[in-house]
Interface confidence: medium
């Protein structure tokens, strides 16, 4: 009995559902009463899910697996694995027995995109050319381990004195911290690129260091020049700082965070105490750091709707303010590719190739390429639709006349995260069916 599974590993994002495809060819007159189907871990032989004696025996895998029962009679023995975890990674074997028996193993490769790196500088005050500084690039909750590259403003690699460490967090996802020690020039840009080798997604962070400006009479309020990028569902820190004078006490401080455009109150600290969040209880100050001049605001469980500009007002005797932009982002899933028609294809046929990628933000840029990487511009229709959380599902359709054979690649780019998700389909010259049987 021939059992067919994908040759390549099935890549699944942490928290999503994965389908481990497995199929067999039922003979005429086949009934499910004849079928024994067993899914097990390839290495330890432990049972994951089974169908025997004409019925689904259920999940032995923490109730996170399911069969496609309505498709079993047609030879679809695929397994659905729900809410994928890092610990699920590995090989699963699909055993099918009717009269004869056959088996095949499919690999599950778990992945999670890395967040846009946050950059910190130490020391970060009164810097002069010739000073040695430590620049830290931190990117969170990715899987598997990242590759980290440093570059200068011209894109040339910075290799000297870099220490990179990676640690699994409470869910087995990796937080990566890369530290670059460098002697400052007159000014300079230092970029860090965190690459997920499985998703082929790159996350970029950069910091530009210029000489300090001299202080003015008013309270100088400092915020990041670049937008703060936050992944949907994570917490974001809107950084804001001021320089307290000697003898400063919190009783003198009035701190107000508000939406820049509508002036609506988000959070305040007045009369020596935290007045709390006016923003659905999702904001907090760093109260233990306020006296040192840290007026930053923590925004929890970021949503698409939070995107925009926030103003930090600081008043002691004088007053100052500055606005910081929050840019919300979510990575796009690896594109799925479909082909229509998908049977008996011949050179000269016109086909429609659809590339679909899900739950990203903001809107994606979609590029089509041939097997040589040359752009395919003609007859492409791309649509993007916001789902119930405001995240975008993108569908790009390419109409093309088949050559003798060819590869058609779709690249879905998140312009904020600078993360690229790739999908491709190869169509050979012989009459064929897609996906291959």
């Amino acid at each position: 009995l021939e059992v067919q599974v994908p040759e390549d590993p099935v890549v699944a994002l942490v928290g999503t559902d994965a389908t481990l495809r497995c199929s067999f060819s039922p003979e005429p007159g086949f009934s499910l009463a004849q079928l024994n189907l067993i899914w097990q871990l390839t290495d330890t032989k432990q049972l994951v899910h089974s169908f025997t004696e004409g019925r689904d025996q259920g999940s032995a895998y923490a109730n996170r697996t399911a069969l496609f029962l309505d498709l079993l009679a047609q030879g679809n023995a695929s397994l659905r694995l729900q809410r994928v975890r890092v610990a699920d990674e590995g090989s699963f074997t699909c055993f099918v027995s009717i009269r004869d028996f056959g088996s095949a193993a499919v690999s599950l490769q778990v992945a999670a995109p890395y967040s846009k790196p946050s950059m910190t500088l130490e020391p970060n005050k009164d810097l002069r050319p010739g000073d040695t500084v430590t620049i830290t690039c931190s990117s969170y909750r990715g899987y598997p381990e990242a590759e980290v590259f440093w570059q200068d403003g011209q894109g040339a690699p910075l290799t000297g004195n870099v220490t990179t460490s990676q640690m699994a967090n409470e869910q087995g996802l990796f937080d990566v911290h890369s530290v670059l020690r460098v002697v400052l020039g007159a000014n300079g840009t230092y970029s860090c690129l965190v690459r997920n080798p499985v998703l082929q997604q790159d996350a970029h962070g950069s910091i530009t260091i210029t000489p300090q400006r001299s202080p003015t009479g008013a309270v100088e309020v400092q915020v990041p020049e670049d937008p703060v990028v936050a992944l949907v569902g994570t917490d974001a820190t809107l950084r804001c700082s001021f320089s307290p004078e000697p003898g400063f006490s919190l009783a003198q401080l009035n701190l107000i965070w508000q939406l820049t455009d509508t002036k609506q109150l988000v959070h305040s600290f007045t009369e020596g105490r935290d007045q709390g969040s006016a923003y659905a209880n999702r904001t907090a100050l760093f109260l233990d750091l306020l006296a040192q001049g840290n007026a930053s605001l923590r925004l929890q469980r970021v949503r698409v709707a939070d995107e925009g500009s926030f103003t930090c007002f600081v008043s002691i005797r004088d007053f100052g303010s500055a606005a910081v932009s929050l840019q919300v982002a979510a990575p796009y899933s690896k594109p799925s590719m479909t082909l229509e028609p998908n049977k008996d294809l011949r050179p000269g046929d016109t086909v429609t190739i659809t590339c679909s990628s899900y739950r990203g933000y903001p809107e994606a840029e979609v590029f089509w390429q041939d097997g040589q990487g040359a752009p395919l511009t003609g007859n492409v229709t791309t649509s993007q639709m916001a789902n119930e959380q405001g995240l975008f599902d993108v569908h790009s359709v390419l109409r093309v006349v088949l050559g003798a054979n060819g590869t058609y690649s779709c690249l879905v780019r998140n312009p904020v995260l600078q993360q690229d998700a790739h999908g491709s389909v190869t169509i050979t010259g012989q009459p064929m069916t897609f996906p291959p049987e």
Partner: antibody, heavy 120, light 107 residues
């Protein structure tokens, strides 16, 4: 970062059994594999077995099959190892340690170890 | 089972010296080797895994080279706090196995 707190030292007689515990905190118990390892004084480490709390799967080093039995209590995020038919050869420090998956058998967080002494 | 062999049980060194510890696998383990440090009365600490990934907080004077069957763990400038036993471990296939350990001592 996560902690693993192991039960106290045990003095047991030959032929008896012992149950060691490893209480975890600071990470999602069902997202990691827990392994147990043995170290005799002045010697190297031996991997005994792992357990994956999610579905309760286990995998044993053949050398310890029938000797060790791993279980978990997910409600308290605690892993247990029952060690049976003890002989003086079983006197050692036993560590629990976590790892990310069955394909990633390196141990990033360790318990402090439980000393088991088998003596009549 | 895959046997991991650390040829030196003891290595004498001085503070500031460069020292290399070797580990040989009885069969190809690709890059699936981890290195641990263990001080007296403590549990082992993960330093490096998958041949080249540095665990968080591990100083950068620890480096590793090699793949396949031959691996080298190097301390570029030995500090007093580096005196300990170092173990290599293959995480290529179960049963996962450790080398016999190399104890770093001061001359």
């Amino acid at each position: 970062q996560g902690q693993m707190q192991q039960s106290g030292a045990e003095l047991v007689k030959p032929g008896a059994s012992v149950r060691l515990s490893c209480k975890t905190s600071g990470f999602t118990f069902s997202s990691f594999y827990i392994s147990w390892l043995k170290q005799k004084p002045g010697q190297s480490l031996e991997w005994i077995a792992w357990i994956y709390a999610g579905p309760g799967y286990t995998s044993y080093n053949q050398k310890f099959t029938g000797k060790a039995q791993l279980t978990v209590d997910t409600s308290s995020s605690t892993a247990y190892m029952q060690f049976s038919s003890l002989t003086t050869e079983d006197s050692a420090i036993y560590y629990c340690a976590r790892h990310v998956g069955r394909q990633r058998g390196y141990f990033d967080v360790w318990g402090a170890g439980t000393t088991v002494t088998v003596s009549s | 089972d895959i046997v991991m062999t650390q040829s030196h049980k003891f290595m004498s060194t001085s503070v500031g010296d460069r020292v290399s510890i070797t580990c040989k696998a009885s069969q190809d383990v690709s890059t699936a080797v981890a290195w641990y440090q263990q001080k007296p009365g403590q549990s082992p600490k993960l330093l490096i895994y998958s041949a080249s990934y540095r665990y968080t907080g591990v100083p950068d004077h620890f480096t590793v080279s090699g793949s396949g069957t031959d691996f080298t763990f190097t301390i570029s400038s030995v500090q007093a706090e580096d005196l300990a036993v170092y173990y290599c471990q293959q995480h290529y296939s179960t049963p996962w196995t450790f080398g016999g350990g190399t104890k770093l001592e001061i001359k």
